[in-house]
């Protein structure tokens, strides 16, 4: 197979015919050294998935349910290109499965038992698989056959295409359960009509169904959406209140050696030449031979799926949960409202060991999951492999953009017993230099810089945000002669100063000696000219407070702060000499786990928090000999957020604006994936 050939998998004679036409037309418009199409015919989409996994084909377009099959082992395929619908300016690659109710009803998602339900059709995504998959563990046992369990859960339903003889209750609202538009309650509009007419109490449809059926806002205002956290929202707020986000139609490829760049090059060229309204001879998004061949006829074009986005992230936690429940038919032994152990995400092996010790001391109420970077941990929380972790504000922003929520804040200044209910204002992000140097904020160009990590608040977002507004470009590695900013590209000058050891050089975790607040300060002590840290870093690592060899003889007076007005001040004066106020670190979790995490952590800190005085012979949650493992070592307590329970409210408008501005310089693959 030539290196530049993409072997497209076709699943019918008609698809194979269109594929050959696709191949011939691409050959006519692409240079000889460009990508080419080859066609492979298989009997079904599942056969195509297996063929791609076995390297007998390279690509196929799949519906969401099949993307799930493609991702499962041993297939291990991943999404590489998404079809989009709507306009190029506002491309839609996903739709949202929602539960719509009338505003004047008064039940929540966890009170659906005994209600009347309207579905688009048996086995359909938004109308059946997702809602029934998510409700699966609440269905009465035995849960097989599924239709019987659903019939016994709701007091009456309309499920088009169901067997009305065996399951009459599923057809109670639409006698016969007709499987076409002859049934007035069939498909999306039909299910909504079933609710509108008062036949049903809830309709399981797409987010767009309401808008397509009710042009008038006043009419739409008579309806609400049921959210998974047992609240309701207006029908406009479907992005924050849905059962699952469903990808429409996706090209998949192998995770390793999958030719994704070549596939994108091919499809990007294809949409330029043969996309909507581009050519009379061949049309990518229609065919005289049949409907939806190779691609959906309703598609308007393609978008490249960000490389960090694997199938789990692409399909989303709710969708995968629903489909897995339906397919595997397994439910937890504990009732769903009971808090299972909370899985903490630990960064690399140092944090993992502290987490394990916590796990033992919590008698297994805490379990541990590991990842090599903070972004990998956030991704694990998103997909349910982990539940929570504590994050610097810069990562609270990324986690928030990825759908996670802040749960508790680390407090550093408020003594107990008021600590748990106090909202602190934050800490100061400062620039530290040696007293012996002549540096000021205005002559940092060409100097050696030390950062906690890329994407973190005091070490990156605040100083680089300020720098960006001064230099108006993102080439920070050219501004400083060299530095250590863990998480930078390995060949960047901002990795040159890092200490490693070797395979971990410049990695954004504790394996890199210059990572974090203490690491950045150590970098200043040993190699650098300026360190961007929190205001407490110098006092916490001088005067013998840090017993490590590099720190034990350091004196506080040998370091000073740079002020934005060009002056310098003592490290004792951060209130009058700082770069900005930074939001405290905070614990984040998925919305569905937030209450559990909060309850458990408040309980854990009562046992292992700052009230424990002897940490040499007792487990202490907020102690790790200046290494800030799992939590900052200067944490006094974890505090309730009260109404600051979204990332925007928690971080504050000013900080969110600063980080959003810096996004044009973003090197965060996760942020790119979460904003896709």
């Amino acid at each position: 197979v030539p290196e530049k050939s993409v072997r497209w998998c076709a699943v019918s004679e008609h698809e194979a015919t269109k594929c050959q036409s696709f191949r011939d037309h691409m050959k006519s418009v692409l240079p000889s050294n460009g990508p080419s199409v080859a066609c492979v015919k298989k009997a079904s989409h599942l056969d195509c998935i297996r063929a791609i996994a076995a390297n007998e084909a390279d690509a196929v377009t799949l519906d969401a349910g099949l993307v799930y099959d493609a991702y499962l082992a041993p297939n291990n395929l991943k999404p590489v290109v998404a079809e989009f619908y709507g306009s190029k300016e506002d491309p839609q690659t996903f739709y949202y499965a929602v539960a719509v109710v009338k505003k004047d009803s008064d039940f929540q998602m966890n009170q659906l038992r005994g209600r009347k339900s309207c579905h688009t059709g048996l086995g359909r995504s938004a109308g059946w698989n997702i809602p029934i998959g998510l409700l699966y563990c609440d269905l009465p046992e035995p849960r097989k056959p599924l239709e019987k369990a659903v019939a016994n859960f709701f007091s009456g339903s309309c499920v088009p295409c169901a067997d009305g003889t065996d399951f009459p209750q599923l057809c109670q609202l639409c006698p016969g359960c007709g499987c076409s538009t002859l049934n007035q309650y069939f498909s999306y509009s039909g299910a909504f009509k079933c609710l509108k007419d008062g036949a049903g109490d809830v309709a399981f449809v797409k987010h767009s169904t309401i808008f397509e059926n009710l042009a008038n806002k006043a009419d739409r205002d008579q309806y609400e959406l049921l959210c998974l956290d047992n609240t309701r929202k207006s029908v406009d707020e479907y992005k924050d209140c849905h059962l699952a986000r469903v990808p429409s139609h996706t090209v998949v490829a192998r995770s390793v050696g999958g030719k994704e760049d070549l596939i994108w090059e091919l499809l990007n060229q294809a949409q330029e030449h043969f996309g909507k309204d581009k050519s009379k001879e061949f049309q990518l998004f229609s065919s005289p031979h049949g409907k939806d061949l190779l691609f959906k006829d309703s598609a308007h074009g393609f978008l490249k799926v960000p490389p960090r986005m694997d199938a789990k992230m692409y399909l989303g936690y709710e969708y995968i949960t629903a489909i897995r429940n339906l397919r595997e038919g397994t439910c937890p032994e504990a009732p769903t409202d009971e808090c299972k152990p909370v899985k903490w995400c630990a960064l690399s092996h140092h944090e993992r060991l502290k987490c394990d010790e916590w796990s033992v001391n919590s008698a297994g109420k805490i379990e541990c999951e590991s990842a090599e970077t903070t972004e990998d941990c956030i991704a694990k929380i998103m997909n349910g492999e982990a539940d929570a972790m504590s994050l610097d504000g810069g990562f609270v922003y990324i986690a928030g953009m990825c759908g996670l929520v802040p749960v508790l804040a680390e407090n550093y200044n408020t003594p107990n017993p008021n600590c748990e209910n106090t909202a602190e204002e934050g800490y100061f992000a400062v620039a530290v230099v040696k007293s012996s140097s002549d540096l000021t904020w205005d002559n940092l160009k060409g100097k050696k810089s030390c950062h906690t990590a890329v994407g973190r608040t005091a070490g990156w977002n605040i100083p680089m945000g300020l720098l960006y507004s001064k230099i108006n470009h993102c080439r920070f590695d050219e501004f400083f002669s060299e530095g250590c900013a863990p998480g930078s590209e390995k060949n960047s000058s901002l990795c040159k100063l890092c200490m490693g050891p070797s395979p971990n050089l410049c990695e954004p975790n504790n394996k890199e000696g210059y990572y974090g607040y203490t690491g950045a300060f150590r970098c200043l002590v040993e190699k650098g000219d300026v360190a961007f840290v929190k205001h407490q870093t110098v006092p916490q690592n001088t005067g013998g407070k840090n017993p490590d060899a590099w720190a034990k003889n350091l004196k506080e007076e040998d370091y000073e702060l740079l002020c934005l007005d060009g002056s310098r001040k003592s490290v004792q004066e951060p209130a009058n000499c700082h770069l900005a106020r930074a939001p405290n670190h905070a614990v984040v979790a998925r919305k569905d786990k937030a209450d559990c995490v909060q309850t458990l952590l408040l309980d854990q800190q009562r046992m292992f928090g700052s009230s424990v005085t002897d940490c040499s012979s007792n487990f202490c949650l907020f102690e790790s000999k200046t290494k800030d493992l799992l939590f900052r070592d200067d944490t006094v307590c974890l505090a309730k957020l009260h109404d600051r329970n979204t990332y925007e409210k928690y971080l504050g408008e000013e900080y969110v604006k600063a980080v959003t501005n810096l996004r044009k310089c973003s090197t965060s693959p996760l942020l790119e994936a979460c904003t896709f």
Epitope: H349, H350, L353, K354, D356, E357, V360, N361, A363, S616, S617, N618, F619, S624, K625, K627, L629
Partner: nanobody, 117 residues
Framework: QVQLVESGGGLVQPGGSLRLSCAAS????????MAWYRQAPGKQRELVAG???????TYAGSVKGRFTISRDNAKNTVYLQMNGLKPEDTAVYYC???????????WGQGTQVTVSS
């Protein structure tokens, strides 16, 4: 820092038992948490079982009901009783007091357990 020496490993048939011991050169009475870890070839080191000074224990899901951790403060020793051994339990087993391991990354020599017919 406390010096720890593991012993008691060996070759055993599936379904068999072994008792591992970990002797501390200092007093373990002042140490809070002790734990057994294992590392199979090409895999990450993983927590098997842990015990606090007050006797709170926790176990990895894969060993629950088969392994029992205990400690004898008077003898400065921690034990791991392993019953119903399976081939997948084959690994080098290490014990730790945590106080040194998560800062200096200090580990003893470990003791090899091989489960094979």
């Amino acid at each position: 820092q406390v010096q720890l020496v593991e012993s008691g490993g060996g070759l055993v048939q599936p379904g068999g038992s072994l008792r591992l011991s970990c002797a501390a050169s200092g007093s373990i009475f002042s140490i809070n948490t002790m734990a057994w870890y294992r590392q199979a070839p090409g895999k990450q080191r993983e927590l098997v079982a842990g015990i606090t000074r007050s006797g709170t224990t926790t176990y990895a899901g894969s060993v629950k009901g088969r392994f029992t951790i205990s400690r004898d403060n008077a003898k400065n020793t921690v034990y791991l009783q392993m019953n119903g051994l399976k081939p997948e339990d084959t690994a080098v087993y290490y014990c730790t007091d945590y106080s040194s391991s998560y800062y200096q990354d200090y580990w003893g020599q470990g003791t090899q357990v091989t489960v094979s017919s």
